[in-house]
């Protein structure tokens, strides 16, 4: 990563150095030493203190996005004097370079697609390059297949998720001969970035008075089970005047997923179609393919 | 109807192993997750483990650890737990259930529960 | 000892209204994670009556509702029936560990 690190520090340095892979903080050990605390502040002038490392001289930031600028902070008293020491961390290049308009999204349960803009002020030959890490940061995940525009890599397709954890870190790197180009990173859920299969399975059973919808919960990437879902019916009744409102039906995610409704015999043509939500987020998916009950001259 | 029917009631020596099984009707096991509970009354429920997606396995609460085993066979749709070197702090009410979210846990349906009770 | 602090016991007439509270810790409801609550009726086993904090499974009444603020949460009741006598647990999970944790159990008493 192009990234300039500069040291702001008093003449007895802590050597205070930061690893963007690891995202772990480090300086000197010092003797004696009955205090330590390291923070970082960003351009918002918000303060992020993670826990120390058992040695106490490290540190590692769990969630932080870094292409704003920070600076890192390290204070260490010792039983004779105190350290200070700053660590500027700014994204170097020229300003506007990076990829910008970046957005993941996972479909069909197991393949995701990432997408970004070039950057405004980018020169022709920028290249980017994606990185993927997961929350444990057992595993750096380097992009397999790029979407190309033009020859620039502005994508990303991914059909092995195996490496991911529920939230993950997105790097996007830029290079060019002519200029240094600024990186883009974010944090991402993968619950918020999913975008669910209709219900599978989809059949409607009628008696003489009640009619009874079943269907299955989607297959999704996520580890779900049936109380993480929330569906909606799209209860519709053919040849209807145009402006006819549809009869839209919330229903809980239940261990055998079923609607039963009154309807009589005769019954005129109606179809059905369903639709599927994490119920916490009401991500809605699209709708499954309409099943059609009923008859013409009901 | 989804419903779990566990095996009856069992009473052990000390130091002796307890078996029991968890049967899941109108529903495959395979497309389910199983974890095991029990109740007493001085501890009130204690989760003992189950199928953990993230770890893809069947995790085990620490306290349990080492005298604990949660196995399944989906082709008769049965779950098992297996606790082993018994005490007399053991007896208890032992439930399967069915997890109805991962995150958090939340067990959506429960067997009838198995009463287990060591004594010498 | 329950991880989650619950009152021994509640009780009200018929037609009132009842709240249990379930208070937690930062590391387990105000981590946050959301709290389910499970009802038993005297001799049977626990069923499942709020998840994700105020959400009911098909099947139980919107007479039992839930709400969650900070660190504790509580289970109301409403239009209380001699039926709904039974102890009430909440649960949540604990930060760094896997599985639940539940809270001693309030024994709601119908008078």
């Known amino acids: 990563e192009k990234s300039d690190l500069r040291t702001v520090a008093p003449a007895s340095s802590l050597n205070v150095r930061f690893d963007s892979r690891t995202m772990n903080l480090s300086w000197d050990c010092q003797e004696n030493t009955t205090f330590s605390k390291c923070f970082l502040t960003d351009k918002k002038n918000r303060v992020v203190e993670p826990r120390l490392s058992n040695n106490e001289c490290s540190c590692t930031f769990r969630e932080i996005c870094l292409h704003e600028g920070v600076t890192f902070e390290v204070h260490v008293n010792t039983s004779q004097r105190g350290f200070q020491q700053k660590l500027l961390y700014p994204n170097s290049g020229r300003e506007g370079t990076a990829a910008q308009n970046f957005s993941c999204f996972i479909y069909n349960a197991d393949l995701m697609n990432c997408t970004w803009a070039r950057g405004p002020t980018a020169p022709r030959d920028v290249q980017y390059f994606l990185y993927i890490r997961n929350s444990k940061r057992r595993r750096e995940i380097r992009c397999p297949y790029y979407i190309q525009d033009s020859g620039t890599h502005v994508g990303c397709h991914l059909d092995n998720l195996s490496g991911l954890t529920s939230r993950n870190y997105f790097l996007v790197n830029g290079t060019s001969r002519e200029i240094g180009i600024q990186f883009f990173d974010s944090l991402l859920d993968t619950k918020k970035i999913e975008r669910f299969n209709p219900p599978s399975n989809v059949t409607v059973r009628c008696n003489t008075t009640h009619c009874l919808v079943r269907w299955k919960q989607p297959r999704t990437y996520q580890k779900l089970s049936y109380l993480d879902f929330q569906y909606q019916l799209d209860v519709h009744r053919k040849n209807t005047q145009p402006g006819t409102e549809n009869l839209l039906i919330n229903v809980s995610g239940d261990l055998e997923n079923r609607y039963n409704f009154p309807s009589s015999e005769p019954r005129a043509k109606h179809s059905v179609k369903i639709r599927a939500a994490d119920v916490r987020i009401l991500n809605w998916s699209s709708w499954s393919e309409a099943i059609e009950f009923g008859s013409d001259d009901g | 109807q989804v419903q779990l029917v566990q095996s009856g009631a069992e009473v052990k020596k000390p130091g002796a192993s307890v078996k029991v099984s968890c049967k899941i009707s109108?529903?495959?096991?395979?497309?389910?997750?199983i974890h095991w509970v029990r109740q007493t009354p001085t501890k009130g429920f204690e989760w003992m483990g189950g199928?953990?997606?993230?770890?893809?396995?069947?995790v085990y609460a620490q306290r349990f650890q080492g005298r604990v085993t949660m196995t399944e066979d989906t082709s008769i749709d049965t779950a098992y737990l297996t606790l082993s070197s018994l005490r007399s702090d053991d007896t208890a009410v032992y439930y399967c259930?069915?997890?109805?979210?991962?995150?958090?846990?939340?067990?959506?349906?429960w067997g009838k529960g198995t009463m287990v009770t060591v004594s010498s | 000892q329950a991880v989650l602090t619950q009152p021994s016991s509640v009780s009200g007439a018929p037609g009132q209204r009842v709240t249990i509270s379930c208070t937690g810790s930062?590391?387990?409801?105000?981590?946050?994670?959301?709290v389910s609550w499970y009802q038993q009726l005297p001799g049977t086993a626990p069923k499942l009556l709020i998840y994700?904090?105020?959400k009911r499974p098909s099947g139980v009444p919107d007479r039992f509702s839930a709400s969650k603020s900070g660190t504790s949460a509580s289970l109301a009741i409403t239009g209380l029936q001699a039926d709904d006598e039974a102890d009430y647990y909440c649960a949540t999970v604990e930060a760094g560990l896997s599985g639940s944790v539940f809270g001693g159990g309030t024994k709601l008493t119908v008078l």
């Open positions: 994700h904090n105020n």
């Open positions: 930062g590391s387990n409801i105000g981590a946050p994670y959301d």
């Open positions: 259930s069915i997890v109805g979210s991962f995150s958090p846990l939340t067990l959506g349906l």
């Open positions: 199928f953990d997606p993230e770890e893809n396995e069947i």
């Open positions: 109108g529903h495959s096991l395979s497309e389910l997750s």
